[in-house]
Interface confidence: medium
């Protein structure tokens, strides 16, 4: 495939990445799948600058990001190292809370209404943000 040089329609460019902000809600897995079908991934926050950009666009609304611990340790969906990377959890989070009564703990991370992160039940229907890098090869065939 060819390298993407500009963002798709309705996506927003920032620092060589393209972002798409949903206005409806889905469970984390459905949001993850939606982004993959768009040749993208749920947003991976690697800096405070990127955090500010994303939260400026989402406003004070719970919104999924590409961070989960469904298999044990916290992992970013694109393989970015969690331990050494940027973090912005709310105080006392993540807490893998079991008291919600929905079964299990909390395995998926989202932006809260002040921008900082919380872990929550992955089935909750939150908005989401997709991200794709401009410099990566597109899955579309090259134009001849």
């Amino acid at each position: 495939g060819s390298e993407r040089t500009c963002c798709p329609v309705n996506w927003v460019e920032h620092e060589r990445s393209c972002y798409w902000f949903s206005r409806s809600g889905k469970a984390w897995a459905d949001a993850d799948n939606y982004c993959r079908l768009e040749d993208a991934h749920l947003v991976v926050v690697t800096s405070w600058e990127e955090q500010k950009f994303v939260q400026h666009h989402i406003g004070p609304v719970n919104t999924w990001m590409g961070l989960h611990d469904q298999n044990g340790p916290w992992k970013w969906v694109d393989g970015t190292d969690y331990e050494t990377g940027f973090k912005n959890w709310r105080p006392e989070q993540p807490d893998d809370w079991y008291g919600h009564g929905l079964g299990g703990g909390e395995d998926c991370a989202h932006f809260t209404d002040d921008g900082r992160w919380n872990d929550d039940v992955c089935q909750r229907p939150y908005r989401w943000v997709c991200e794709t890098e401009l410099d990566k090869a597109s899955q579309e065939p090259p134009l001849l």
Epitope: E49, K87, P91
Partner: antibody, heavy 126, light 111 residues
């Protein structure tokens, strides 16, 4: 003009509870773009953030790790004020206590204190 | 105690330029969180001097300027004046503490 007016006793006995109140004029304790903080200052610890209370569709409290087990904030919308309770005080808690506002909006999410109360010297001594 | 480190004191003659450093770590300044500066005159509450690394609130003279690089920040005072004699504190946010952190404070003396 926004002002923060602090009140509370200046002397507290060891093991008792320190209680301070900060009355807000010209702004709202339940503002969606502000948070209301307590900060203390002593020669031994310097400036130390104790925590904050703020409203974003519901009330939140953030507490500093160093005092988390002993501290409680209580916002009062009817009086437009917020209070601090610090339990089981020791002489180490002797300090000037300030209330302060931090501003936060989505276009400009910098966290800083743009407004301070005048401070209350609290001495912990028997 | 304080997470951000500043020199205890700096001094300069009137008209000179002095700088105050503020050193943090990868979970505060190094993570990209903005640095803010406060001036505290004797017997008064701290007053916001610089916010967002380099922005001055209205009413603050342009003799005061701030900058940030890596895990540290600095405050510069040019054309030092007698009324600048005060304590200066840096402040940021720390993601590992999920809270605000202050510098150790620097006393500026005008000779």
């Amino acid at each position: 003009q926004v002002q923060l007016q602090q009140s509370g006793p200046g002397l507290v006995k060891p093991s008792q509870t320190l209680s301070l109140t900060c009355a807000i004029s010209g702004d709202s304790v339940s503002s969606n773009s502000a948070a209301w903080n307590w900060i203390r200052q002593s020669p031994s610890r310097g400036l130390e953030w104790l925590g904050r209370t703020y409203y974003r569709s519901k009330w939140y409290n953030d507490y500093a790790v160093s005092v988390k087990s002993r501290i409680t904030f209580n916002p009062d919308t009817s009086k437009n004020q917020f209070s601090l309770r610090l339990n089981s005080v020791t002489p180490e808690d002797t300090a000037v206590y300030y209330c302060a506002r931090d501003r936060y909006n989505w276009n400009y999410p910098y966290w800083y204190f743009d407004l301070w109360g005048r401070g209350t010297l609290v001495t912990v001594s028997s | 105690q304080s997470v951000l480190t500043q020199p205890p004191s700096v001094s300069g003659a009137p008209g000179q330029r002095v700088t105050i450093s503020c050193t943090g770590s990868s979970s505060n300044i190094g993570a990209g969180f903005e640095v803010h500066w406060y001036q505290q005159l004797p017997g008064t509450a701290p007053k916001l001097l610089i916010y967002g690394n380099s922005n001055r609130p209205s009413g603050v003279p342009d003799r005061f300027s701030g900058s940030k690089s890596g895990t540290s920040a600095s405050l510069a005072i040019t054309g030092l004046q007698a009324e600048d004699e005060a304590d200066y504190y840096c402040q940021s946010y720390d993601s590992s503490l999920s809270g605000y952190v202050f510098g150790t404070g620097t006393k500026v003396t005008v000779l």
